[in-house]
């Protein structure tokens, strides 16, 4: 398994991950935005909640 | 493939503004922040400015600043730089620059020459 | 803003040769540096990025050091093809470039 070096984004990526924690994937030269629950998206912009569908009638 | 493509040369008179668009392909600018570098002819590396084309905020170099101003449009996957109260020494070649899901991938560059 | 003060301006090497550039920060730039090579009419290319990881495709005669305010970028062994101007950019906060360093062959 390749070992990926990460370490925080500098200042300058400040407010760039809206929704979650910025990291530097160093090997990779690309800033990586690690979601908050209930996020999505390259910049966690996106929020999605996860319905929990009743019983049909049918199935019961 | 990613790209990013400028607009083509232009020549202005002192006094005039100038607008270059940089149009992005292969990925989405909202998932960057576009940057704007530019250089003077036989000169050094000069950063302008740039745009978080998500949230719509821009940060400027002090010496640009009111001179300067950066947009873009996410329906387009377009940038644009636009410097008004042009003078000789704005004559460079402007590259914009994608950061943020990737370390600086360079557009080709625009010459925007300011000549009477 | 962050100032880059990079030096030598210009140098002039021999083939084989070790070559030194050196960029200070005017403060702690936490390593956040990157080191570009730009050859004449073309655009600059990216060669190394936080402080020292070499990108793909990078010669391994190019490294980079450094932390806190002071930062080298190092030729191992000068080739022919190495002519070009290297630029230095911190991006820590903002970005500044560094004002550049002519090397030529001797």
């Known amino acids: 398994v390749a070992q990926v070096s990460i370490t925080k984004c500098s200042s300058d990526m400040n407010g760039y991950c809206l929704h979650g924690q910025c990291i530097y994937l160093v090997d990779m030269s690309q800033n990586y935005c690690r979601c908050e629950v209930g996020y999505t998206g390259v910049r966690c912009e996106h929020f999605f909640l996860t319905v929990h569908q009743p019983l049909s009638k049918e199935y019961v | 493939q990613d790209q990013l493509v400028q607009s083509g040369a232009e020549v202005k008179k002192p006094g005039a503004s100038v607008k270059v668009s940089c149009k992005a392909s292969g990925f989405n600018i909202k998932d960057t922040r576009i940057q704007w570098v530019r250089q003077a002819p036989g000169q050094g590396l000069e950063w302008m400015g740039r745009?978080?084309?998500?949230?719509?905020?821009?940060k400027y170099r002090e010496k640009f600043e009111g001179r300067v101003t950066i947009t873009a449009d996410t329906s387009t996957n377009t940038a644009y730089m636009e410097l008004s109260s042009l003078r000789s020494e704005d004559t460079a070649v402007y590259y914009c620059?994608?950061?943020?899901?990737?370390?600086?991938?360079w557009g080709q560059g625009t010459l925007v020459t300011v000549s009477s | 803003d962050i100032q880059m003060t990079q030096s030598p301006s210009s140098l002039s090497a021999s083939v084989g040769d070790r070559v030194t550039i050196t960029c200070k920060a005017s403060q702690d730039i936490h390593k956040y540096i990157a080191w570009y090579q730009q050859k004449p009419g073309q655009a600059p290319r990216l060669l190394i990025q936080?402080?020292?990881t070499l990108q793909p495709g990078v010669p391994s005669r190019f490294s980079g050091s450094g932390s806190g305010t002071d930062y080298t970028f190092t030729i191992s062994s000068l080739q022919p093809e190495d002519i070009a101007t290297y630029y230095c950019?911190?991006?820590?906060?903002?970005?500044?470039f560094g004002g550049g360093t002519k090397v030529e062959i001797k």
């Open positions: 936080y402080t020292s």
């Open positions: 745009i978080d084309p998500l949230r719509g905020n821009t």
């Open positions: 620059v994608r950061s943020g899901t990737l370390f600086d991938f």
């Open positions: 950019l911190q991006y820590d906060n903002l970005r500044t």
